[in-house]
Interface confidence: low
């Protein structure tokens, strides 16, 4: 079955960077876009961006442009999200989630378990 | 960015009774060729969001048929025909028509 397994929780200082990994299994990794979404305490879910593993094409939420980098390692079926210049408001649970076309419909279907990133001095 | 507004934000329900959640977008979510990328997710306590409905009204496989989606343009609704105890959690709508994709603020469904 489709599974997305993320790396463990991270505690970072303001100004530092964090890199979260997401390993996909149970499906053809290169056939589906990988999305990244975060959820800060008491906030709505927020879409960060997406990457096409087959060609490494990316689309980013402008809010994160310049601070976030999405990459993949196809050989390891793993996607990465790196967020730099961290600030306290980046404290959130970060999710990877698979997206794909089903016939003519598109949806983000399966989600990772989430990675808590805490930014604190 | 497209703003997604859900209502109500809190929904106390009685098991066996119907429930309805509304989601309104600040602009039309219909693509030029007719598709509308509007989906609904349920996030149960301590879990990741799970897909319920995609393309406005298509139930994701394994989702009970008590869940249904409807709407068009800017107004969308998720209905639960008979709420069960396992349905509690926070429900989110998501638009995937315009980038950046945006979520509603969530509707917390809890048993009365």
């Amino acid at each position: 079955q489709v599974q997305l397994v993320q790396s463990g929780a991270e505690v970072k200082k303001p100004g530092a960077s964090v890199k979260v990994s997401c390993k996909g299994s149970g499906y053809t990794f290169t056939s589906y876009w990988m999305h990244w979404v975060r959820q800060a305490p008491g906030q709505r879910l927020e879409w960060i961006g997406e990457i096409d593993p087959s060609e490494s094409n990316t689309n980013y939420n402008q809010k994160f442009k310049g601070r976030v980098t999405l990459t993949v390692d196809i050989s390891a079926s793993t996607a990465y999200m790196e967020l730099s210049s961290l600030r306290s408001e980046d404290t959130a649970v970060y999710y990877c989630a698979r997206g794909g076309y089903d016939g003519w419909d598109y949806a983000i279907d399966y989600w990772g378990q989430g990675t808590l990133v805490t930014v604190s001095s | 960015d497209v703003v997604m507004t859900q209502s109500p934000l809190s929904l106390p329900v009685t098991p066996g009774e119907p429930a309805s959640i509304s989601c309104r977008s600040s602009q039309s979510l219909a693509k030029s060729y007719g598709n509308t990328y509007l989906s609904w997710y349920l996030q149960k306590p301590g879990q990741s969001p799970q897909l319920l409905i995609y393309g406005i009204s298509n139930r994701f496989s394994g989702v009970p048929d008590r869940f249904s989606g409807s709407g068009s343009g800017t107004d969308f609704t998720l209905k639960i025909s008979r709420v069960e105890a396992e349905d509690v959690g926070v429900y989110y709508c998501l638009q995937g028509t315009h980038q950046p994709y945006t979520f509603g603020q969530g509707t917390k469904v809890e048993i009365k």
């Epitope: 053809t28 089903d102 | 298509n58 994701f60």
Partner: antibody
Framework: EVKLVESGGGLVQPGGSLKLSCAAS????????MAWVRQAPRKGPEWVGF????????YYADTVTGRFTISRENAKNTLYLEMSSLRSEDTAMYYC??????????????WGQGTSVTVSS | DVQITQSPSYLAASPGETITINCRAS??????LAWYQEKPGKTNKLLIY???TLQSGIPSRFSGSGSGTDFTLTISSLEPEDFAMYYC?????????FGSGTKLEMK
């Protein structure tokens, strides 16, 4: 070239179970919806059910609803039909077929050679 | 369910002739009707979909027409390899349903 090869058919008693497989090759399996169609001796074909490319949507004929389960493993390029509570009227040749939905006008464009299922005591 | 009535159930013709097979749906299915050819020992072959669209690789002597409830498959200048079983199928809504078949035999 597109190839669909069914397997798993055989003789089973009424009330018994059987799992059919369909191995696909020659195309990107995860891009296509797949269907099962059966044909009883001296009868026309009967559509059994359909599973969309990412398995978001699964549909069944009324005659098999609750007894048959369609699934797919895109990572293995394989389609399945799990049949339980089998009846004599389920005796048929079972075909898997690719549904070409790329035009938005779906038709079953490639079929397998079929696998025979006989339900008899 | 949409009922599909196919006629005739049997047809004898000679190579070079033109034949037609008809299918009628119990309600409007727009243009969404497909035609298949079935031969012993071979996999079913899609000939026509969406009423009149020729599947790639299918000879142009095969043509489809019709919309709504009434559809026709025409094979002009029959070739020896065209003698086979033909089925129509609606792909307008689930459950997909088939006609009962037309057996085309050589005179």
């Amino acid at each position: 070239e597109v190839k669909l090869v069914e397997s798993g058919g055989g003789l089973v008693q009424p009330g018994g179970s059987l799992k059919l497989s369909c191995a696909a090759s020659g195309f990107t399996f995860s891009d296509y919806g797949m269907a099962w169609v059966r044909q009883a001796p001296r009868k026309g074909p009967e559509w059994v059910g359909f599973i969309s490319n990412l398995a978001y949507s699964i549909y069944y004929a009324d005659t098999v609803t609750g007894r048959f389960t369609i699934s797919r493993e895109n990572a293995k390029n394989t389609l399945y039909l799990e049949m339980s509570s089998l009846r004599s009227e389920d005796t048929a040749m079972y075909y898997c077929a690719r549904e070409d939905g790329t035009t938005g006008e779906s038709a079953m464009d490639y079929w397998g050679q079929g696998t025979s299922v006989t339900v008899s005591s | 369910d949409v009922q599909i009535t196919q006629s005739p159930s049997y047809l004898a013709a000679s190579p070079g002739e033109t034949i037609t097979i008809n299918c009628r749906a119990s309600k409007s299915i727009s243009k969404y009707l497909a035609w298949y050819q079935e031969k012993p020992g071979k996999t079913n072959k899609l000939l026509i979909y969406s009423g009149s669209t020729l599947q790639s690789g299918i000879p142009s002597r095969f043509s489809g027409s019709g919309s709504g409830t009434d559809f026709t498959l025409t094979i002009s200048s029959l070739e020896p390899e065209d003698f086979a079983m033909y089925y129509c199928q609606q792909h307008y809504e689930y459950p997909y349903t088939f006609g009962s078949g037309t057996k085309l035999e050589m005179k």
